[in-house]
Amino acid sequence: ATKLTEEKYELKEGQTLDVKCDYTLEKFASSQKAWQIIRDGEMPKTLACTERPSKNSHPVQVGRIILEDYHDHGLLRVRMVNLQVEDSGLYQCVIYQPPKEPHMLFDRIRLVVTKGFSGTPGSNENSTQNVYKIPPTTTKALCPLYTSPRTVTQAPPKSTADVSTPDSEINLTNVTDIIRVPVFN
């Protein structure tokens, strides 16, 4: 069984979170994907999503978040640029598959953003000088309003969870508060 785990990223203000969520391409290549934040005691909120159906290697930008879905490679790339302290939180990638419930992809990301900037970025830390230029054709994708038929009685786990699943994606049943977000080019 695959455990529901999370990775802790410690970055400085102004840096870029640059991660990949891998999925079973045969099952989910063209499915709509989303990037969500899970705040303690709250339900996941969708911050950005790809188009439906998801387009191959086509950047979608929502504020400081850029999503790029590489169908051939079974990878969703997520970038959060110019990080702020208030961006700290638990994040996850999910796949929408209506009418089924969304699938969550491993691993969750626990982002901790601190003040100050380290002069020499680490191997995963892009500096503020890396301004991501997105083509003007960036899609204004709206995320679907998804309400789970089940009620959640507890907040998602904070650290490496004891939840075990037989597959690399799990059904996400605790999504009750998905927000629509504007897209900026």
């Epitope: 590489y70 490679h73 990878l75 990301i109 191997s123």
Partner: antibody
Framework: QVQLVQSGAEVKKPGASVKVSCKAS????????INWVRQATGQGLEWMGW????????GYVKKFQGRVTMTRNTSISTAYMELSSLRSEDTAVYYC?????????????????WGRGTLVTVSS | DTQMTQSPSSLSASEGDRVTITCQAS??????LNWYQEKPGKAPKLLIY???NLETGVPSRFSGSGSGTDYTFTISSLQPEDIATYYC?????????FGGGTKVEIK
């Protein structure tokens, strides 16, 4: 000793398939993605795709889709790359390479550990 | 796909010389670039990652710089053991692509 040990050289006829193995030792096999890169004689390096040994997820370069299959056996810490419908232009040295990442899910594609390579010759 | 144009394809320099190799991407790759050294009969070796970070254990005479589409790899003082072919590799976009390589020889 941290290393990737690949299977020996192969000679194949056009239309046949080849399966190259890559055994990891000295580190936790399931903690790092394995990539495959090839190099035809006198040519540059060409990425073929990646595999997550933990979950078995894979991604292939479009050029090889339908012909390549990347698998693994976690019990023996071994990754495999099978290429079918071989043609003469597939004659190359095939490398497995470990993708190093400070964080498992970070968008980092640095290959810090390579196998010695497996020469695959396709000839009638 | 992002094309990587590496130049020169070969060069010959004297021991102690400063050697510079360039790689130009067909689109902005945001510093997502690595440099490898390959010696005959051996697997490639990572030297520089994310455009300018020196891999652990690699001599400080090797360095990398650049941004956007243009990147440079430098050997500040060429040594006999540096005879090899050098490749750049981008990961700003998938598929990952490599430059054509630069063969470095000593005069």
């Amino acid at each position: 000793q941290v290393q990737l040990v690949q299977s020996g050289a192969e000679v194949k006829k056009p239309g046949a398939s080849v399966k190259v193995s890559c055994k990891a030792s000295g580190y936790t096999f399931t903690s790092y993605d394995i990539n495959w890169v090839r190099q035809a004689t006198g040519q540059g390096l060409e990425w073929m795709g990646w595999m997550n040994p933990n979950r078995g997820n894979t991604g292939y370069v479009k050029k090889f889709q339908g012909r390549v299959t990347m698998t693994r056996n976690t019990s023996i810490s071994t990754a495999y790359m099978e290429l079918s419908s071989l043609r003469s232009e597939d004659t190359a040295v095939y490398y497995c390479a470990r993708r190093r990442a400070v964080y498992r899910s970070s968008w980092e594609w640095y290959f810090d550990l390579w196998g010695r390579g497996t020469l695959v010759t396709v000839s009638s | 796909d992002t094309q990587m144009t590496q130049s020169p394809s070969s060069l010959s320099a004297s021991e102690g010389d400063r050697v510079t190799i360039t790689c130009q991407a067909s689109q902005d790759i945001f510093n997502d670039l690595n440099w490898y050294q390959e010696k005959p009969g051996k697997a490639p070796k990572l030297l520089i990652y994310h455009a300018s970070n020196l891999e652990t254990g690699v001599p400080s005479r090797f360095s990398g710089s650049g941004s956007g589409t243009d990147y440079t790899f430098t050997i500040s003082s060429l040594q006999p053991e540096d005879i090899a072919t050098y490749y750049c590799q981008q990961y700003g976009n998938l598929p990952l692509t490599f430059g054509g390589g630069t063969k470095v020889e000593i005069k």
